[in-house]
């Protein structure tokens, strides 16, 4: 049987290395060895290139070397495929070797900020020495920010024939590292070279950002004062390496700015004591580049009433996130703070917040959260400087088994009835839900009883037991990953109520 | 349409000189390596010369290496052959032609170059 | 050197076909392109089949271009001949060892009655 007919030539130039076509069948049924023969110098000249019985038989790619590689040329490609039954001939294909040239890729040698031009880096690099001189080549740069994943493009070419070339890229962020890797081709090629190595630069620093600033309103004191804690944080978008040397904060009751009030800080929160009043809070970051533009926060008075429109609220967990959704009666707000934090019977330890704007969910990467931790979650509206009712939930982003069981007390023993009473696991070793709690009992060498009831009953009366009797009873408390008993308990029941009169028959 | 049209040829004497020329029309010259390709009197044809699209790299058959030299000039879309120290057994039609891959593809009609004393 | 030979001159019947040959005499023929150029009396050459076995489109189908591997030949095959036919044929290769063209001596053909 004849060989197939090769097909699929596909021929690269690997500039100053090598010409070198592949195609298929890669493989034949029977012993097959190649013929490619090419016509070069514009078809002047023809030469063969052979994968030769005995090392590359059966191997469906062949190279052509230098010195007969010149360039720029059309090229003639056809392969001939031979075993013992005979030969079969390609389609003659053509190649222009400007159109397949394939090149080393630059060197970037430096990724630096041109002093006093903002988000802006120059990128230098040095042309492939393997590169055609005279040709214009045209480059993909790639970039990133440090800390992301994802690649941005540009695209542009040179057409000088200098040893290091440059580029500004424009419109980045502010004080922020970016990692840019370069590559390039002849303009005409569908070839590009690999990327260059990576090589990281920093935009120069600029005045602060901005900030987000929220606070927790506390109750009144006795006195009357109010405290509220400030809080802010860089704002969405900031640059990550942005560094403030400081913060100053002023304040003043609505319509009253001879009572402004300021402060200076080098923290992210402050607490504020404030009268019943409607007061305007305002805070700028600074470094030695100027200030942020002014964030702003209005306090509501101690009476005001605050409107209310999340009318639902679900936590639900995908594979890594924890998605929060809401429904709002109020088409109009469509900016809400959300506050987390843990549900622990202590102070919280660690606060968090953050502003959502244009949707009416949140998500959060389920690691950012511990597991067996209750969290709490609230959203509050926000309309322009209003901010109106929160609604809140919990969550846990995993669940455990509880970390201990209830403590559990017999009350009330009677003859045929005990009470059973038992403490809420405090919030620390919940590990979940409590979903519900059952109730094991077993008289001495008897058969096991079991009673199950919702997790809001902390209480349960037995009854039909046997007079007289020792049981043993112990507690589990149960989340959706499964229970822990709490510590086994002994009671008898009595031989007699306590309440039954006593008569005494005489004979 | 393409077209080849030789001129220059003439009788010379044995050890002369002669320049040949052959203007192209119809096609994109400098893109293409040409050739002067000879016929003596009843006899088969012979490859005189080729040249480069740029005109960088020059061919010869070996025997007319060091007495004849092929040119071109793109922007006049002109290809010359400059014969000297010419000899009898140069007397031939000499025809200029354009090559395709790996062959003639357009001939002009060719120049009479006759070397006799 | 490898040198194309070719048998001085052919005579073939009108209607009939004429087989061409172009042996090569060092070399394998199959490693190089033969063309085959057709010559009238008065005119220069024409090409009629290239690179193995091309026809350019304004030649007649009659003419085809193959290769004899065992005779390590190039082939001319017209078929149907006609007295237009009559003509002298060149093959033609590449030969790396000149680095140029080299032209077999050519072969006459005759188209008989």
């Known amino acids: 049987v004849l060989p197939a007919k090769p097909e699929n030539i596909s021929c690269i130039f690997y500039y100053e290395e090598n010409f070198t076509c592949t195609w298929s069948p890669e493989k034949e049924a029977s012993y097959t060895w190649y013929k490619v023969k090419r016509t070069y110098s514009y078809g002047y000249k023809s030469d063969i290139c052979s994968t030769d019985n005995s090392t590359r038989g059966n191997h469906a790619s062949c190279s052509f070397l230098p010195p007969t590689i010149t360039n720029p040329d059309n090229y003639t490609i056809q392969v001939e495929a031979q075993n013992a039954d005979g030969i079969m001939k390609s389609d003659i294909t053509y190649w222009n070797l400007d159109a397949i040239m394939k090149i080393e890729p630059p060197e970037i040698f430096s990724v630096k900020s041109v002093l006093g031009i903002k988000r802006m880096l120059q990128i230098k690099w040095i042309r492939p020495v393997l590169a055609p001189h005279s040709s214009t080549l045209k480059y993909t740069l790639r970039f990133r920010t440090i800390n992301s994943a994802y690649w941005m493009e540009v695209n542009f070419t040179k057409e000088d024939i200098d040893r290091d070339e440059t580029y500004n890229l424009t419109e980045l962020q502010a004080f922020t590292e970016y990692v840019m890797t370069l590559r390039c081709a002849p303009a005409e090629s569908m070839f590009w070279s690999g990327w260059s190595q990576e090589k990281v630069g920093t935009t120069e620093e600029e005045a602060p950002y901005g900030l987000d600033l929220w606070r927790v309103l506390k109750p009144a004191m006795v006195d009357g004062r109010r405290p509220v804690q400030l809080m802010w944080k860089k704002a969405t978008g900031a640059p990550v390496l942005e560094k403030a040397l400081g913060y100053n904060i002023w304040y003043f009751p609505e319509n009253n700015t001879n009572l402004t009030e300021t402060v200076n800080t080098t923290n992210q929160t402050h607490e504020l004591y404030l009268g019943g009043k409607t007061y305007w809070v305002y805070v700028v970051s600074y470094n030695s580049l100027g200030e942020s533009p002014v964030a702003t926060l209005r306090i509501p008075a101690l009476n005001e009433k605050t409107f209310q429109c999340i009318e639902a609220m679900q936590a639900c967990l995908t594979q890594d996130q924890l998605v929060v959704e809401w429904q709002s009666s109020a088409p109009e707000v469509d900016t809400w703070m959300v506050e987390w934090f843990p549900d622990v019977d202590s102070e919280p330890s660690s606060f968090s917040w953050e502003s959502v704007s244009q949707a009416r969910n949140w998500t959060i990467q389920k690691d950012e959260l511990k597991p067996l931790w209750c969290y709490n979650i609230s959203v509050y509206p926000v309309l322009r400087d209003r901010v109106g009712q929160p609604y809140s939930t919990q969550a846990y982003v995993q669940e455990g088994i509880p970390s201990a069981g209830p403590v559990t007390q017999a009350d009330s023993i009677g003859v045929k009835t005990v009470t059973i009473t038992w403490k809420e696991i405090p919030k620390s070793k919940r590990n979940g839900f409590i979903k519900n709690y059952t109730i094991f009992y077993q008289a001495e060498d008897g058969k096991e009883f079991s009673k199950t009831v919702n997790s809001n009953i902390l209480q349960y009366r037995l009854e039909s037991l046997t007079r007289r009797t020792s049981y043993s009873l112990q507690v589990m408390a149960s989340t959706n990953a499964g229970g822990t008993n709490g510590t086994k308990i002994n009671f008898k029941t009595l031989s007699i109520s306590h309440h039954h009169h006593h008569h005494h028959h005489h004979h | 349409e393409v077209q080849l049209v030789e001129s220059g040829g003439d009788l010379v004497k044995p050890g002369g000189s002669l320049r040949l020329s052959c203007v192209a029309s119809?096609?994109?010259?400098?893109?293409?390596?040409m050739a002067w390709v000879r016929q003596a009197p009843g006899k088969g044809l012979q490859w005189v010369a080729s040249?480069?699209?740029?005109?960088?790299?020059?061919y010869y058959r070996d025997s007319v290496k060091g007495r004849f030299t092929i040119s071109r000039d793109n922007a006049k879309n002109t290809l010359y052959l400059q014969m000297n120290s010419l000899r009898a057994e140069d007397t031939a039609m000499y025809y200029c032609?354009?090559?395709?891959?790996?062959?003639?593809?357009?001939w002009g009609q060719g120049t009479l170059v006759t070397v006799s004393s | 050197q490898p040198v194309l030979t070719q048998p001085p001159s052919l005579s073939a019947s009108l209607g009939t076909t004429a087989r061409l040959t172009c042996e090569r005499s060092?070399?394998?023929?199959?490693?190089?392109?033969v063309s085959w150029y057709q010559q009238k009396p008065g005119s220069p050459p024409r090409d009629v089949i290239y690179?193995?076995?091309?026809?350019p489109s304004e030649v007649s189908k009659s003419f085809s271009g193959s290769k004899d591997t065992s005779a390590n030949a190039g082939l001319l095959l017209i078929s149907g001949l006609q007295p237009e036919d009559e003509a002298d044929y060149f093959c033609?290769?590449?030969?790396?060892?000149?680095?140029?063209?080299?032209f077999g001596g050519g072969t006459h053909l005759t188209v008989l009655g």
């Open positions: 032609a354009k090559h395709g891959t790996l062959y003639f593809d357009y």
């Open positions: 119809g096609f994109t010259f400098s893109n293409y390596y």
């Open positions: 040249i480069s699209t740029g005109g960088g790299n020059t």
């Open positions: 060092s070399g394998d023929i199959g490693d190089s392109y």
């Open positions: 690179v193995d076995d091309q026809r």
């Open positions: 033609q290769s590449y030969d790396s060892n000149i680095d140029g063209p080299v």
